[in-house]
């Protein structure tokens, strides 16, 4: 396997993770794919300290994170447990609002202008943050 010991160019290192902050928007699924192509994942917020770090870098802009409930319960994309983990929802959120008229509810979480979280329609083209961990062994798949 291989280990990443330093962050790629244009990524920001913080607490043994690397972060990349987009400056354009994509739908949640497209942002997720972008991160995966970079051997990363949409940001998973595990502490108040990490929340403040991300919030500082994104500013007051709606920004996707790696949290969704498209298959029922809320899940972090890296498998981090949602129920016992850090949360920073806005009051009354998540509300799975259907009143937007776009069809369905709201299944993807994003940072709002004050940093707190909201659920929204996954197709909205918001900015996003990718995260990858340093020193995380990555076994290359066998060649077929």
């Amino acid at each position: 396997g291989s280990e990443r010991t330093c962050c790629p160019v244009n990524w920001v290192e913080h607490e043994r993770s690397c972060y990349w902050f987009s400056r354009s928007g994509k739908a949640w699924a497209d942002a997720d794919n972008y991160c995966r192509l970079e051997d990363a994942h949409l940001v998973v917020v595990t502490s108040w300290e990490e929340q403040k770090f991300v919030q500082h870098h994104i500013g007051p802009v709606n920004t996707w994170m790696g949290l969704h409930d498209q298959n029922g319960p809320w899940k972090w994309v890296d498998g981090t447990d949602y129920e016992t983990g850090f949360k920073n929802w806005r009051p009354e959120q998540p509300d799975d609002w259907y009143g937007h008229g776009l069809g369905g509810g709201e299944d993807c979480a994003h940072f709002t202008d004050d940093g707190r979280w909201n659920d929204d329609v996954c197709q909205r083209p918001y900015r996003w943050v990718c995260e990858t961990e340093l020193d995380k062994a990555s076994q290359e798949p066998p060649l077929l």
Partner: antibody, heavy 118, light 107 residues
Amino acid sequence: EVQLLESGGGLVQPGGSLRLSCAASGFTFSSYAMSWVRQAPGKGLEWVSAISGRGVNTFDADSVKGRFTISRDNSKNTLYLQMNSLRAEDTAVYYCAKERSGSYFDYWGQGTLVTVSS
Amino acid sequence: DIQMTQSPSSVSASVGDRVTITCRASQGISDWLAWYQQKPGKAPRLLIYGASSLQSGVPSRFSGSGSGTDFTLTISNLQPEDFATYYCQQTNSFPWTFGQGTKVEIK
């Protein structure tokens, strides 16, 4: 200097298999996603498959899903495309391409021709 | 899939002319668009990425603009080496898709 050199193309019968290779040099291969893009004779460009730098994540066009497999060996700086169940419509020049941030192709190989015919 | 439609399919121009090629996406792609140049028998060459950023080594007579669904590649002061086929490509969503190409021919 970045160089990408494809090989493995040739004439194959419908239903047959072929494995294309792309030897890379001049950059840190494992740090970049790579893609295969094809171009049928006299036609436009069609993206085929992409793979992340470590080879963990792959993405495929619907037209090749389940038939083609993209892979890489970072110890050999080589990208592969395993092509199975080939069809006449797969006939094309196949290019490997290095991706820059944003998934744009900043370097391309010279291409290798795959002809599927009986 | 996102469809990319280029116009015109071909254009005849003279050295020194200003040539404009347009590319329209079937849905919004923000600025996730690139332009490539391809000459017969050769691999494509990246000219513009992010809709308007000039790739290193590409002459400044090439410029790109647009956002959302409508994009433009402009070649000002067309040079002999610019006669080629030009493709747009979106990387907003998988599968990444290309326009059908615009051939710039000598008048």
